[in-house]
Structure formats: C-alpha cells, structure tokens
C-alpha cells in the first residue's frame, strides 16, 4: 500500500526497484566453454533495479548513504542493488587430471539489497 | 602500468574508479541529532567511483555481471562500488533509560569492491 514502510514498497512502480531477476547465459556468453562442461546454459539470478531512499537498505551505512545522497547527490552516490546472499551451484569442469564437480558459493544471487 | 591486472589498475584515470572517500557529516545531516550525542561530526568513509570491466570484482558473480553487462547493457547493470568491509565506530546515544555507548559495526566503510 502507499503507506507501507519504504523498505518494502517500491515508490517507482512495480518491477522498478531493486529485485532478483533471472538472466539466461550460455557458457559461450561467460567465456567458460573451454573449461566448464555442464550445465551448457545457466539460469543466473542477478540483482537489478533502482534503490530509492531507504528501499531495502543493507545496513546503517546504506541508510546514511541514501540520506547523504539526497543532500549531496554530486558527491555521494545513491545506494545500488547488489546480492545480499547467494545460492550455491555445482559445475562440472575440466581439470589437469580429468573432470570434476566443483561447488561455487558466490555465483548465483539468491537475494538482493541496496548497499 | 598499462599492463597491470584490471583488478588493480583504473583504466578511467586517477580517482575515477571504485575507491574509499571521506565524507564529513554532522548529526543534523544524518537526522540523528535527537538521539546521538557524540561525536557531533562523523568522518564517514564511503565507496564511490565507477566499476569498469573486472575492476576490483567482489567475487565470481561480479565477474559474470561485468561480462553480461558488456553483452546486454540494457538488461544487466554494471557492477557497482560498495563496501567490502567496515570499521566499527562507537556512538554515544540516548536510550529510554539514559545515555550509553553503542558500537556500530556497519556504519563506516573500510574497503570497497565492485559487486
């Protein structure tokens, strides 16, 4: 609603504020086709959208940043939308000794906030 | 040098890429004058500057983001400059039961990276 806390309600309209979005990417897109075998295509969740004042503030620093951006927009940038957590994903890749499965903890975003 | 690893060398020129910068802020600037007593003025280190391709990438996700931004700039945003670590700071503030010292772990940035 219009009266929701600014942390949770996007004043810019649906889908405009910081959120998680799925981006399809092939191994070729990532430049990984020479060392990753599977999967051939990744569903990469990424953080996109704007960070209006106090929306999904990551912490106290982000709240301060938002406020100072309002006062000195030329000097202090607005907070921006970045991952708050990640979903681990397993890739099959080539190694010197053959093929192995490797878990990557920081590859796919699971949640987003404004930092 | 021109051949330095992109993580460490700013291709945009001195001071243009993601770095730590000190911003002076009063309690009034922060809207804290009614509950914080000291310090009257804070030296707030903040992360500012651009994140060109692979510059100070926070992790694998940020490297992917940089690459996909190059391929789909309208769909995937460039990585942005955010704190990688914080310096704890103590504030003296009012509480319901009086005045006390409180440590804030996430108020002043200590380092920056591109996420």
């Amino acid at each position: 609603s219009a009266h929701a806390h600014p942390r949770d309600s996007c004043p810019l309209g649906p889908g405009r504020c910081c959120h998680l979005e799925t981006v399809q990417a092939t191994l070729e897109d990532l430049g990984w086709s020479d060392w990753v075998l599977s999967p051939r295509q990744l569903q990469l969740s990424m953080c996109v959208g704007e960070c209006p004042h106090l929306y999904r503030s990551a912490n106290t620093h982000a709240q301060i940043k938002a406020r100072l951006h309002g006062l000195q927009p030329d000097k202090v940038p607005a907070p921006c939308c970045v991952p708050s957590s990640y979903t681990p994903v397993v890739l099959m890749h080539r190694t010197d000794s053959g093929v192995s499965l490797q878990t990557y903890d920081d590859l796919v975003a699971r949640g987003c906030h404004c930092a | 040098s021109a051949h330095a690893h992109p993580r460490d060398s700013c291709p945009l020129g001195p001071g243009r890429c993601c770095h730590l910068e000190t911003v002076q802020a009063t309690l009034e600037d922060l809207g804290w004058s009614d509950w914080v007593l000291s310090p009257r003025q804070l030296q707030l280190s903040m992360c500012v500057g651009e994140c060109p391709h692979l510059y100070r990438s926070a992790n694998t996700h940020a490297q992917i983001k940089a690459r996909l931004h190059g391929l789909q700039p309208d769909k995937v945003p460039a990585p942005c400059c955010v704190p990688s670590s914080y310096t704890p700071v103590v504030l003296m503030h009012r509480t319901d039961s009086g005045v006390s010292l409180q440590t804030y772990d996430d108020l002043v940035a200590r380092g920056c990276h591109c996420a």
């Epitope: - | 007593l37 000291s38 310090p39 310096t87 704890p88 700071v89 103590v90 504030l91 003296m92 005045v99 006390s100 010292l101 440590t103 002043v108």
Partner: antibody, heavy 118, light 107 residues
Framework: QGTLKESGPGILQPSQTLSLTCSFS??????????VSWIRQPSGKGLEWLAH???????RYKPSLKSRLTISKDTSRNQVFLKITSVDTADTATYYC??????????WGQGTTLTVSS | DIQMTQTTSSLSASLGDRVTISCRAS??????LNWYQQKPDGTVKLLIH???NLHSGVPSRFSGSGSGTDYSLTISNLEQEDIATYFC?????????FGGGTKLEIK
C-alpha cells in the same frame, strides 16, 4: 557492557618499575572513538587520572607524571598496559582502568592494589 | 590543570531525603562533567555524563545540573544503597581531573 580487570605485582620496592595490565571484554580498542584510561586512588584519598590511550594509539598523560608513565595496548588480546618507572611510597594506591569514549568513562575495573615498601 | 573542588567532604542525611552535592571548576568546563559513585568496596560507577545526562541503567532519582563552573548532583529520595562517596570529574581538557569526593552517610 564492558568488563575490565586490572592486574599488577601487589608489592614493589622503591625505585622499581610498576607494570600493570588491564584485560577487558565486551568491547574492542579497534573501535573508532574508543579508549581506555588508568586512574589511581591512594587509600582514603581522591581519584587521580594518569593516562589515556585511544583506538588509534594516540596517548595522553598527566603532565606532572609524564616522564615516568608509558601507556600501551595490544588490541588483538584486548589488553592495555601501564608502566610507571622509579616508584616511591607516594605511588602506593589502588590502580583502576576504565573504558571511555567522548569523555564518557562508563565502565571501571575493580582495581588492583599496589604497596611500595622497602 | 583545571582544579575541581567539592567543598563538602562528608554529608549526613536521612533515608528519603533530597541530597545535593556540589562541585566547582577553576574555569568554565562547558558541561564536560561526569559524576561517579564509589561504594565502600571500591566499586566505581558512572552516574551522570555531560553534567546532566543520566547514564543508562542509573535510577532516575539521580540527576545532574549546572553550567560554566558550578555543577551539582541531586539524589531526590535517598536510599540505603546510595551510601557511597561521590566524585565529579571534568573532561573539558587533559589532564582530566577529579573533585576530592563527598562521602554520603546515613544519619
């Protein structure tokens, strides 16, 4: 909440060097703005501030004792130290350490007693 | 050095009384004054910071006031547990200095 505890030799002879340790928990001297002071109190008398060390290693001393005092810290071990050279019977007192920020000295140790006697 | 003077070194009062302890600085200390309570066992507690700000957790019967060079600590309703020695301390400039203390006793 901060907790501080002083330790020292208990008894010294005149001209010896006093080494005191303040071990603390519940806060850190890596925190911007934080500091620790040493204060002493001869039996039945008032309090006397001796020295202060800040998080950034800035140090302050009581001018009349400055030549005899050295304050230092080990941030990683949560300890602050005070050395007093050439002790005399006038240095017989209870020595306290206390945490402080912005002049607010909010938590004190229980004190450690020193007797200087030949 | 700034001299801090507590003219009353000891004070006798009855339980329930309103007690005022005074402290004078040798120069203007701009409200940079703390009040401490020291119990007979040596335990020291901060009561008041910046002349009038009650430290968190201190009973509201304690209050501080003053400005310039003259300051006071008031206990509005004296309780048995308030039997102690009270010290003022300036932190306007180094070296920080304390008053000589006021010992509070029960009549």
């Amino acid at each position: 909440q901060g907790t501080l505890k002083e330790s020292g030799p208990g008894i010294l002879q005149p001209s010896q060097t006093l080494s005191l340790t303040c071990s603390f928990s519940g806060f850190s001297l890596s925190i911007s703005g934080m500091g620790v002071s040493w204060i002493r109190q001869p039996s039945g008398k008032g309090l006397e501030w001796l020295a202060h060390i800040y998080w950034d290693d800035d140090k302050r001393y009581k001018p009349s004792l400055k030549s005899r005092l050295t304050i230092s810290k080990d941030t990683s071990r949560n300890q602050v130290f005070l050395k007093i050279t050439s002790v005399d019977t006038a240095d017989t007192a209870t020595y306290y350490c206390a945490r402080s920020a912005y002049g607010m000295t909010d938590y004190w140790g229980q004190g450690t007693t020193l007797t200087v006697s030949s | 050095d700034i001299q801090m003077t507590q003219t009353t070194s000891s004070l006798s009062a009855s339980l329930g009384d309103r007690v005022t302890i005074s402290c004078r600085a040798s120069q203007d200390i701009s409200n940079y004054l703390n009040w401490y309570q020291q119990k007979p066992d040596g335990t020291v507690k901060l009561l008041i910071h910046s002349a009038s700000n009650l430290h968190s957790g201190v009973p509201s019967r304690f209050s501080g006031s003053g400005s310039g060079t003259d300051y006071s600590l008031t206990i509005s309703n004296l309780e048995q547990e308030d039997i102690a020695t009270y010290f003022c301390q300036q932190y306007n400039m180094f070296p920080w200095t304390f008053g000589g203390g006021t010992k509070l006793e029960i009549k």
